[in-house]
Structure formats: C-alpha cells, structure tokens
C-alpha cells in the first residue's frame, strides 16, 4: 500500500508568491510559491495519485505583514482552502498568546491540529479542550493513518504561551499516544512536529512505533540529487535514521517559506511495516502556474494590507537616525530602538533568578536603511519602517560563548572606516574600541548586561560563559562575514519579522525618543 | 461531558417574534462556535445562522437576514436566537449545535415553535 | 449558494444489505461534507465528517467518499438500528443540508 505525503514548515506567512530568498515578490516572472502556487500542485498529485495527505509541521504564523493583519484568520482560511490534512503546533502559533491561537486558527481550522506534548491546565484546560488534540486517525484509500503532533519544548523562551500550558518532552509525550494508536489497531504511524531536525532524528529512533517523522522548526533543506535552487542540502531526502528497536525510519523536513512542497512516497507492507521511501521537496517556481481562483482570493484579502501600511503606528518626537553615515561608524538611535524593540518582544519567563531569559542584542548596521525624520508630525507608519528594514528578516535568539561574542566584537571593527555594513549596533552590550590597535585586538572593554540578577547591571564577558543573544537572522547565518557565529552557534531559533518587532514595540510605547547614550564608544 | 439544553416548546401568533435558548455546559461554551438549524414537521434540516461566543461574530443563511438575531450571555453559556415576523411556514423544531471542525458535533435537543393564529 | 441533491430520497433495503446514498454539490465542495443520522423524535448524530473522517464511536459499518462534486455515503451491512433519515452536510461555503434519504427495512 502507498502512501504520498506531501508536506510544509515554517511557512510563516508566505501566502503570496515571494522572490527566490522567500523576500518579497519584485519580478512575478521569476517568484515562487504561495498558496495559490502550492494549490495547483497539490491538486494535480491528488488527482494523479490515490492515498494523499497533506501535512504541516507548524508555524504558519509570523512572517510578513499578512499576519501582523490578520492575526491568523488568513491562515485557518488559505489552510482550509488548501484542505490541510493534519498541522501540528509551532512556537510562533503562540505568538499572540493562546488567545491568539483559539480564535483565529483552532476554532476555524476544518481540520485537526494536533500536539501530544502540550498539556493545558488550570483553567485553559476546559478552554482549549478539544480544540487540539495529541494525535488523530486519519482515512486514506482504504486504510487508516496515525498522525501523532509534537512541538518544541522550548516554546516558553521562543514564544508567548502563557503559564497554562505545560511542554513536555517530546519523545516522553509521544511515546504513549504511540502506544495507543497501536491498540486501536493503527499500524501507519506519522509522527508531525516542530522541534527541530536534532529531535526529529531522536523521534525516530527512540519512538517505538513512528513510521514517518515529518518535521520542522529548523528550515532544513533536504535533497537527493542536483539541489534545483540556492538551498544546500543538509542530508538526502529522506533521511533515514535507524531506529532502536532496528526499522529504517524517514525523516523529513521541506526548508521553509513555502518555497518548495514535500513530496514522500511511502510503501508500507500489510502489517504497517515501511518497505521502501523516496521522493524530493518540489521547488514550486513560475513553472507551476498559480491556482486563479486561490489568487483571485489572495488579491481579495491583499487590500485590507495595503490600508494598513499607511497607518500610524506611533510616534517619535526626535530624529531616527537611521543613516549609513551614523549607523556603520558609531551608536545611532535608530539602532538602539531597534535593538531595544528586539529585548522588548524577548521579555519572557522570569523567575525568583532571572528577570529575563535574555538582554543582550546586535544587529549590523548594514541592516539598518533607512532613516526616519520627526518632522512629518512625527507619524511612524508600517511603511516607514519598511523603508528602514526593507529585506523581510527575522529577528532571532541564538546561544554563544563569550568567546565567539568577542570575535564577532572583533570583526564589527577590523575594517573601521569604510562604510561597511558589519559595524555592530548593540542593545544590553557596552563596548569599546581602540581604533589605533591592530585588526583583530581592538575590543578593550566589553560589558554585558547581566539576567541572573534583580537589578540588571553591566559585568565583563566571559569568554567560557553561555549567552543568548537576539540578533537578525542574518547574521546568525552567517551574513556580513560574521563566520564565527554561524560556525560556533551553540542553539538557534528562529524569531519574529523585523517589522513586525519594532512596530509593536512602538505601537505599545505610543511615543519614543532613543538617545545616543554611550553603548559604543 | 458535552451538553446543549434548549429552552421548552412555544405557541406563536402570525407576526409575533420568538427567543430560543440554549444552555451549553460540559465545555467553554466561548472555545466553539454554535449553529442554529430548523427543521419543519415531515421536512429537511435548514442552516439559520451562526455565532461566536467569545467576540458575538454572526453569520447568517440569506433567507434569514432580515428576520433572525443570533445573541448570547457568556456569563450563563447561553446562546439565543430570536425570530420576527413569524409567519405559519416557521413552525418547526429548531435546533442549536455545536461547531468543530467547520462542521456540527452535538446538537440541543429541540424547541418546538408553532406558530398558528 | 451551494445546493446539494441528495438521492435516493427513500430506500427499502433488507437487514445485511449494502445501502448507498449520493449527494451532488453544485460546485466542488473540498470534500467539506458531513453525514448525520436522525431517529424519528430525535437530533440529528453526526457520523462522518471532512467526506470520510468517522466520528469517534461510530461503527465501522458506516463509511463516506467522495471529492469535487460527488459524494456517497455507505452502510455496508444494514442492521435494525440504522433505520432513520440520513442527511448530507456541505460546509465549503456556509452551510447547506441535502434533502435527506429515509431508510426503512423491508
């Protein structure tokens, strides 16, 4: 008996086509994906092949203004159009709190969500009741598949799920629901879930009974054969892992942004057992014409954005200096408000020994495009801050060493002088440079806040210590030759748009005035 | 477990407007969305409308526009649908159910409104 | 609007017997199509869901298919107890109900 799963992660907002770096859409000739894109495929391997499901592995929230709109209900409606499958819960489905999570997705989607390793209690626990569920057993053909959902454990510090829900381990969690889709007879397992390829692999060699694990939360890209983009693959698709108890298990994951469809052929004996696994990530380019009627849809909720971007946000009562002059040479305001923005969305699981998880951000003041001027009554728009963050990046929480900090301090400064984007813009940071020393030794003091304390205060890094950082993805993959902190990252997890941070933090401050106050000298 | 009590039959003159009710317990009533389905003596089961709990969003069949108003208490987990300008076509049981996965789970079990001059 | 015709409107079938009912949507639906039971005096019971998803508890006698348009539902081995009025639910676009088919025993 075969089974096609085809399958998305970490789309993240993608509904309308976008450029090949998943940025926005310029040349539509040479855009890919979308969901009006991803429809017409979908529909011509349901039509070609018999037992489909079509599986998501998490965060469809946080992307691109469509979620700063609609909050959503834009993707329990193009989800519901798409007729989804199963999803399972990422981190940044949490991202407006449960609250956020009810109304616009669990209580539209016309189809399961699914996590076997959140627990609700207290009194969400009656609220959320049956609005997700551990696992579900889905028909396909003639047979029943088991599809079991788990998200990442590390959601707390990545997202805003509030002190109701409790994230278990995930193989701990899954391990039982297993068990019991084999009692009822369920002997077609797919184990759906973001947690990472790390914990996707551990699934399928620990979970006694996960057949397929289909995965998400690290934009893996997996490909067997010549990659048909810029992704470079991180192993073959599948990958397959040999479990404890012996089975070859596939493990598969589909990159991110919608740009390309998951597309798995299982073979499964009478007995549930998997005979063969093959297939590849469908790159969904321009060759792949776009559904009209899902188009005609996305251009009819598409006006609801462009009203908003012109929209006041709040205001500013001084200049954002925003400049290439100011931000790739010294401290400018506008990257302290965007750093500050970037701690502010990070303020999150306190406790009796830490006031934050983290207080430290850099961002290069390359990213930085734009400036903001006061004078047109000092109105900041979605627009604006387009202006002055223009590349529809993330920013993100990472884990380094004190030591790859310093290098990264190091390579901020060892071409001072020419304009060039890598000059760090800090927030939580007090740095200091001495310019006449050579390339490589110019960091002479570098302070960082402290968040084991009741009183935050600056303290010398330590080049053994382990700290998390905010910073833009960028830079956590490598860009603007910061080498070091993709080689030597200890965690990374993926954050909310750019925009998006700062303009909620502007929106909740109503009116800010970021100062030059010494944090680089 | 899941449990929709709707209020007793009722006797309607032609013109007259009439309030169902319809108590949810055993879930948060807020979490779903309840329908409201009519069904005339002998005959199918007609769609009236939709709301949500938690934000009072409605939706409604276009042949009842003009005439229904979906409402609810939260505070009592009640939902109501109100009927005007009854004429003797809206005798039928109407039904109030709940709604997952886009579709209707469990159902109240009944009001009879008749309405006879 | 969506319309769905439902057909047989009313079948006699034998206990054991294999009984099919069909409902036509006016436009693809998405498989978004329920199945519920009705007993004389009673609410209606949902069955099936998304075209072929069982509710929990639902014997496994009963079964849907069906995409686009077409969709059937199936009782594969009729007992006493399913006597009753079965209706299709469409809930791609709103909601619309099929005429119902009145199963009786011969």
């Known amino acids: 008996w075969e089974l096609t799963i085809l399958h998305t992660n970490d789309v993240h907002s993608r509904l309308e086509q976008t450029s090949e770096d998943s940025s926005k859409c310029v040349n539509a000739s040479r855009c890919m994906g979308g969901v009006a894109r991803l429809f017409t495929k979908v529909q011509q391997i349901r039509r070609a092949e018999p037992n489909v499901l079509l599986l998501d592995a998490g965060d469809q929230y946080q992307g691109t203004i469509w979620f700063t709109v609609y909050k959503g209900a834009e993707v329990a409606h193009f989800m519901n159009a798409l007729r989804y499958d199963a999803m399972a819960l990422g981190n940044h489905e949490f991202d407006n709190g449960v609250e956020g999570l009810i109304e616009p997705l669990l209580k539209e989607a016309k189809f399961p969500i699914l996590s076997a390793n959140i627990k609700a209690k207290g009194p969400l626990a009656s609220q959320i009741s049956g609005l997700y569920l551990p696992y579900k057993v889905l028909p396909v053909g003639d047979e029943v598949v088991g599809i079991v959902g788990y998200t990442s454990k590390e959601t707390p510090f990545l997202s805003n799920p509030g002190t109701n829900l409790v994230f278990e381990d995930e193989i701990t969690a899954l391990q039982p629901e297993v068990d019991k889709l084999k009692t009822l007879n369920v002997n077609k397992i797919i184990a759906l879930g973001h947690s990472g390829f790390e914990t996707d692999k551990l699934i399928a060699q620990k979970v006694r009974g996960v057949d397929v694990v289909v995965g998400g939360h690290s934009n893996t890209f997996l490909y067997t054969g010549n990659p048909p983009s810029k992704e470079v693959p991180a192993g073959k698709y599948p990958f397959i892992v040999t479990s404890d108890d012996g089975r070859k298990v596939p493990v598969v994951q589909a990159y991110a942004f919608g740009k390309y469809l998951g597309y798995l052929k299982i073979e499964f004996d009478e007995r549930g057992n998997v005979i063969s696994s093959h297939g590849n990530p469908i790159l969904l380019n321009s060759s792949i014409p776009e559904d009209p009627s899902i188009k005609a849809d996305i251009n009819k909720w598409r006006i609801k954005l462009d009203n908003y971007s012109t929209q006041e946000l709040g205001k500013t009562i001084v200049y954002l200096d925003g400049s290439s002059q100011s931000c790739r040479f010294r401290e400018c305001n506008m990257g302290n408000l965007i750093c500050d923005a970037m701690i502010n969305n990070n303020l999150r699981h306190a406790d009796e020994m830490f006031w934050n998880h983290v207080s430290m951000c850099i961002l290069n003041g390359g990213g930085i495009r734009s400036p903001i001027d006061e004078r047109n009554n000092g109105t900041i728009t979605w627009e604006n801050l387009a202006a002055v963050l223009p590349f529809g990046g993330t920013f993100d929480l990472v884990q380094l060493k004190g030591s790859t900090l310093k290098k990264a301090f190091e390579h901020s400064v060892h071409r001072y002088g020419q304009s060039t984007g890598e000059f760090l813009q800090v927030g939580g940071i007090h740095v200091v440079y001495d310019l006449s020393r050579k390339p490589g030794d110019r960091v002479v003091k570098l302070d960082v806040l402290c968040t084991k304390c009741r009183v935050p205060s600056y303290d010398p890094l330590k080049m053994d210590e382990i700290y998390k950082v905010i910073l833009p993805n960028f830079l956590a993959n490598g860009g603007d030759g910061f080498q070091m902190i993709k080689d030597e990252l200890l965690r990374h997890d993926s954050g909310d748009q750019d925009i998006n941070v700062v303009s909620t933090y502007i929106s909740k401050m109503k009116v800010i005035y970021p100062a030059v106050e010494g944090r680089i000298k | 477990q899941v449990q929709l009590v709707q209020s007793g039959a009722e006797v309607k003159k032609p013109g007259a407007s009439v309030k169902v009710s319809c108590k949810a317990s055993?879930?948060?009533?807020?979490?779903?969305?309840m329908h409201w389905v009519r069904q005339a003596p002998g005959q199918g089961l007609e769609w009236i409308g939709e709301?949500?709990?938690?934000?009072?969003?409605?939706n409604y069949n276009e042949k009842f526009k003009s005439r229904v108003t979906l409402t609810r208490d939260t505070s009592t987990s009640t939902a109501y649908m109100e009927l005007s300008s009854l004429r003797s076509e809206d005798t039928a049981v109407y039904y109030c159910?709940?709604?997952?996965?886009?579709?209707?789970?469990?159902w109240g079990q009944g009001t009879l409104v008749t309405v006879s001059s | 609007d969506i319309q769905m015709t439902q057909s047989p409107s009313s079948l006699s079938a034998s206990v054991g017997d294999r009984v099919t009912i069909t409902c036509k949507a006016s436009?693809?639906?998405?498989?978004?199509l329920s199945w519920f039971q009705q007993k004389p005096g009673k609410s209606p019971k949902l069955l099936i869901y998304?075209?072929?998803i069982w509710v929990d508890g639902v014997p496994s006698r009963f079964s849907g298919s069906g995409s686009g348009q077409d969709y059937t539902f199936t009782i594969s081995s009729l007992q006493p107890e399913d006597i009753a009025t079965y209706y299709c639910?469409?809930?791609?676009?709103?909601?619309?109900f099929g005429q119902g088919t009145k199963v009786e025993i011969k």
């Open positions: 436009q693809d639906i998405n498989s978004y």
């Open positions: 709301i949500n709990p938690s934000i009072g969003r409605t």
């Open positions: 159910a709940r709604r997952v996965y886009g579709t209707m789970d469990y």
């Open positions: 998304r075209a072929n």
């Open positions: 639910l469409q809930y791609d676009e709103l909601y619309t």
């Open positions: 055993g879930y948060t009533f807020t979490s779903y969305w």
